[in-house]
Each structure stands twice: as C-alpha cells, then as structure tokens.
C-alpha cells in the first residue's frame, strides 16, 4: 500500500493526523460509513490536547465521535482501548437514557456544546469529524 504523507484538500493537519470537520449532520452509522469511504474513521480522542484541538474546530455544536456501545461495552472505532484511554464525559454521563421516547437507549457518543461528551440516540443527525493518521500505509488489498 501507499503511505499518506500529507493531508487531503480541505482536511486539517494536527500532530501527524488529518481531520475533516463536517458542516452538516448525519446519523452516527452514516457518518461512520462516510469516514470509512474517505479511508478514515470517526475521530478518536486520545488526549486532552486532541480534545481541545477538536473542540476548537467544531465550536459549540453537537458532533459525533468514533465511540459507541452498540454491542455492549464502549468501544473506539479504531480499536483504541476505552477503559485505559482518555475520557471527557459530562457529569452523570453516559447514562443510556431511555426517556427520549425514540426507542432503546443511547449508544453513540458526541461532543456537546461545551466539548464534554454525552451518549445519545445514534439516529440523531449530528455533525461529525473524520480522522486519518499520516504515515500509515493504506490497506490496499491485493487483486486476486
């Protein structure tokens, strides 16, 4: 595969990663698929420094990140360990709230208006952030 050495047009480089900030909304799964088709993933926040960077770019707007518990435990989309990793939940969150009346609980994490995290209904059409790492060889499969 080929290595990505610089960010695509309209992406922002920061600490050897590239970030793309949507200005429109999609359900979490559609945002996840969108990022994958860009050879990226929904943003995975691994440090306070990265949290502040993303927060600066998204402003006070609900925005999906690459964290969900749709299959039970909380998981980052790139496999980063959740239990030992960086967290920035709002107080009392995540709460898997069922009182919204939309069916089920809340399985997808997003940045809230103050940057801290909340779990919400995955179908809500929030903005999203894609991330891809520089110097990572693209996984181009061999042709059979």
């Amino acid at each position: 595969g080929s290595e990505r050495t610089c960010c695509p047009v309209n992406w922002v480089e920061h600490e050897r990663s590239c970030y793309w900030f949507s200005r429109s909304g999609k359900a979490w799964a559609d945002a996840d698929n969108y990022c994958r088709l860009e050879d990226a993933h929904l943003v995975v926040v691994t440090s306070w420094e990265e949290q502040k960077f993303v927060q600066h770019h998204i402003g006070p707007v609900n925005t999906w990140m690459g964290l969900h518990d749709q299959n039970g435990p909380w998981k980052w989309v790139d496999g980063t360990d959740y239990e030992t990793g960086f967290k920035n939940w709002r107080p009392e969150q995540p709460d898997d709230w069922y009182g919204h009346g939309l069916g089920g609980g809340e399985d997808c994490a997003h940045f809230t208006d103050d940057g801290r995290w909340n779990d919400d209904v995955c179908q809500r059409p929030y903005r999203w952030v894609c991330e891809t790492e520089l110097d990572k060889a693209s996984q181009e499969p061999p042709l059979l």
Epitope: R23, R36, L37, E38, P125, S138, Q139
Partner: antibody, heavy 121, light 108 residues
C-alpha cells in the same frame, strides 16, 4: 479530460460469472471512492457498490451482497466488478461513477458510458 | 433504506414552458438531495447537488429547492435539449444511496 470507460459486459447464462472493468483517466484515481450503478431495461437507476480510494472499504446493495465483489487497481487506474451467481434480474446497463464528497456534497459527478450485461439462457 | 418518490412519472411540455418535478423522501434527508439528467442511450449527468447547488456548466434555468422530505426541480423555460429523464437521489444514508424512479419530460 476526466473520463471513465467500462468494458466486460455481454451475454451470460443464469448462475454464470462476469467481470466488468472501468478504466479511469484525467483525475487522481486513488483519491476518490468509486461506484457501480446499474439500470435495468426501461427502469431507473440502482446503486450497486462502492469502494474507497485505497480499496480498504467496500459496501454493497442488499440485492447483490454475497454475489458481487468490487475491487480496484490504483496502479492501473482501473475499477472492477466481479459478478457471480448471476440472475435474470441482474440484466442491466452497468455504469461506473466517481464519487465526489464534501459533507453536503456527496454525488456521482462523473459517469462512464455504461456496459450492457444480459443474463439469459 | 430511504425510499425516494418522484412525481409525475412523466409529463408533456412545450419549449418555453415552466416545468416542475417533485421528489419526496420517506424520511427527513435534510438537504442531501441531488438531481441527475439522463438522455436516451446516454449516461446520467449531474445537474444539482445538495438541493440547490448548480453543477458547473449547467444552465441557470435549472434550479432546486426544498428541505427535509420534499424537494423540487424547476426548469424555468424549457429548451429543446432539456427533453430527458430526471432522477432525484438522496445522499443522507451513506452508502445506501437511493434514486427516485425518474420523471420523463416529453415534447407536447
């Protein structure tokens, strides 16, 4: 000039296989996700499959899942669609289409001329 | 999947007429709506993306509007080269993009 040129269509019996190709030129092929869209005779357009620029991510319509495979060779600027276990309802003109995306803008901005696939005994 | 329904399925009009085609989504798609034109024996051509943005080179007599579930393609003054089939397409649901069934614009 940005161009897509499909080939590989033809007549095949039910249960048979066919491999379509799409040769791209005039743009940085590896930077774009590519799609196959089909149109049955006298019918509308149906999205079939998409592959990311690197080839690492693929998706399929339910109607072809498990039977069709999409792939690409970025060194040859070529997109492929391997069609197995073909059925009469797969009869259509198959178009390759370049995806251009930027949030709100998520479109098929360039299309090939199409290649006709007929599944019949 | 999100279903897209166009109306009418066909219409007859004269050169100079104002033509309106509507497209309805089975659920809200915000402004993720594109329009394509297809002439017989040819590949589709992108006309309008994200509801109202005209693709480069598309004449200004074409316009799009709407939001949520209801959308409209308008041709302000129909020209001979506009006789074709028009398709709407939603791009909200990635990647299960779906098209309307098409509207054929014929010469009266």
């Amino acid at each position: 000039e940005v161009q897509l040129l499909e080939s590989g269509g033809g007549l095949v019996q039910p249960g048979g296989s066919l491999r379509l190709s799409c040769a791209a030129s005039g743009f940085t092929f590896s930077s774009y996700a590519m799609n196959w869209v089909r149109q049955a005779p006298g019918k509308g357009l149906e999205w079939v499959s998409v592959i990311s620029g690197s080839g690492g991510t693929t998706y399929f319509a339910d109607s072809v899942k498990g039977r069709f495979t999409i792939s690409r060779d970025n060194s040859k600027n070529t997109l492929y669609l391997q069609m197995n276990s073909l059925r009469a309802e797969d009869t259509a003109v198959y178009y390759c289409a370049k995806r251009n995306s930027s949030g709100w803008h998520d479109v098929f901005d360039i299309w090939g001329q199409g290649t006709k696939v007929t599944v019949s005994s | 999947d999100i279903q897209m329904t166009q109306s009418p399925s066909s219409l007859s009009a004269s050169v100079g007429d104002r033509v309106t085609i509507t497209c309805r989504a089975s659920q809200s798609i915000s402004r993720y709506l594109n329009w394509y034109q297809q002439k017989p024996g040819r590949a589709p051509k992108l006309l309008i993306c994200s509801t109202s943005s005209l693709q480069s080179g598309v004449p200004s007599r074409f316009s799009g509007s709407g939001s949520g579930t209801d959308f409209t393609l308008t041709i302000s003054s129909l020209q001979p080269e506009d006789f074709a089939t028009y398709y709407c397409q939603q791009s909200y649901s990635t990647p299960t993009w779906t098209f309307g069934q098409g509207t054929k614009v014929e010469i009266r």
